[in-house]
Interface confidence: medium
């Protein structure tokens, strides 16, 4: 049976969750967000070799066609499978507001 | 206002739906699928430049961090936003069966 967890490119090179620290300035948010001053942005990074963490049938097809036609069909891509919510304290005309964003931080990853 | 659909790389180069013809042999399905003999596989192909078809906040963040740290953070990727169902006639021990797959053909695309 296929081990969908084994990365044939070597440890750590395949699709998985990573965290990148970013300031409000890095994100271009300094003019509308008050807090947090720094965000631990979780995102999906890494290669998607054959059948590694394939999200669905479409990903499996993409892998097959990429093997046949690499110049035409790209390999599957490492993207979020789900997200964690994050609360931002935003500047408003009247003061501040708390806003929850459901699609900001990746929670886990797959290849599609 | 930003036109999230305008491709700065030139017409046709950015993330969009494409169709790739594939035989059952191409897909590795010849041993379990009877029909169709050929599939018009719709898939998402193309570049995701700054804010083009950004799926959500996460995609916008990814664009910002890719600009800052291109060696660490990849650009957003062109993936299906939704799917069209497809019916396959499959071989079974006793004959054939019709099976609908909901995650096989891309319907439209975005960058994430």
């Amino acid at each position: 049976a296929r081990n969908g967890d084994h990365c044939p490119l070597g440890p750590g090179r395949c699709c998985r969750l990573h965290t990148v620290r970013a300031s409000l300035e890095d994100l271009g948010w300094a003019d509308w967000v008050l807090s947090p001053r720094e965000v631990q942005v979780t995102m999906c990074i890494g290669a998607c070799p054959s059948q590694f963490r394939a999200a669905n049938m479409h990903a499996q097809i993409k892998t097959s066609l990429h093997r046949l036609k690499p110049d035409t069909v790209p390999a599957p891509c490492c993207v979020p499978a789900s997200y964690n919510p994050m609360v931002l304290i935003q500047k408003t005309d009247t003061g501040v507001s708390l806003q929850t964003y459901d699609d900001l931080l990746a929670k886990d990853c797959h290849c599609i | 206002a930003r036109n999230g659909d305008h491709c700065p790389l030139g017409p046709g180069r950015c993330c969009r739906l494409h169709t790739v013809r594939a035989s059952l042999e191409d897909l590795g399905w010849a041993d379990w699928v009877l029909s169709p003999r050929e599939v018009q596989v719709t898939m998402c192909i193309g570049a995701c430049p700054s804010q083009f078809r950004a799926a959500n906040m996460h995609a916008q963040i990814k664009t910002s961090l890719h600009r800052l740290k291109p060696d660490t953070v990849p650009a957003p990727c062109c993936v299906p936003a939704s799917y069209n169902p497809m019916v396959l006639i499959q071989k079974t021990d006793t004959g054939v069966s019709l099976q609908t797959y909901d995650d096989l053909l891309a319907k439209d695309c975005h960058c994430i």
Partner: antibody, heavy 117, light 107 residues
């Protein structure tokens, strides 16, 4: 043979910063693996603190992220943990480990850190 | 975070016995389940990764199975050196989380 060894003070005062180092032998920390800190409070389960990766990426458990810094010194083949503003709840055995494919295949023996005045 | 519920918390058995330890995740973890052995004063050892793959050097009496949310570690014939604490860990979603452990004692 890959070996990991934790070192650092066994006693830290409340509100101070806990600092630990993990020395790795038999394998370069500059390779494509994740270098991890885990802790186990007395009589409790294991808690994942976070990792450092060769490209400079780090991950911190959200429950500890505001107080955690994990860094590396490739010249010494070491990686370190700093946990600020400690309380008695941070008393635990702290382990370093290597994760090369979604599993921790080598661990240090662990070092007990007590937070007390 | 994904919660990992391990059972039993302790277990008494004899040399030669077949022993089973179970681990249940609060959501599907797609077979990203690892098992470890812990002995006092020793480094933790990885036994099994990705549900059923034996880590190098681990005796074949250890085996793992499961899918979805439910996973099992089996020791087919207990040896004296197997008396230890065993714990599971999910590697599907960060932060990785662990079961509370099963202490395997001599009867």
């Amino acid at each position: 043979q890959v070996q990991l060894q934790e070192s650092g003070p066994g006693l830290v005062k409340p509100s101070e910063t806990l600092s630990l180092t993990c020395t790795v032998s038999g394998f370069s920390i500059n390779s494509d693996c994740y270098w991890i800190w885990i802790r186990q409070p007395p009589g409790k389960g294991l808690e994942y603190i976070g990792y450092t990766f060769y490209s400079g990426i780090t991950y911190y458990n959200p429950s500890l992220a505001s107080r955690t810094t994990i860094s590396r010194d490739t010249s010494k083949n070491q990686f370190s943990l700093k946990l600020s503003s400690v309380t008695a709840a941070d008393t635990a055995v702290y382990y370093c480990a290597r994760d090369c494919d979604y599993a921790m295949d080598y661990w240090g023996q662990g070092t007990l850190v007590t937070v007390s005045s | 975070d994904i919660q990992m519920t391990q059972s039993p918390s302790s277990l008494s058995a004899s040399v030669g016995d077949r022993v089973t330890i179970t681990c249940r995740a609060s959501q599907k973890i797609s077979n990203y389940l690892n098992w470890y052995q812990q002995k006092p004063g020793k480094a933790v050892k990885l036994l099994i990764h990705y549900t059923s793959t034996l880590h190098s050097g681990v005796p074949s009496r250890f085996s793992g199975s499961g899918s979805g949310t439910d996973y099992t570690l089996t020791i087919s014939s207990l040896q004296p050196e197997d008396f230890a604490t065993y714990f599971c860990q999910q590697g599907n979603t960060l932060p990785w989380t662990f079961g509370q452990g099963t202490k395997l004692e001599i009867k």
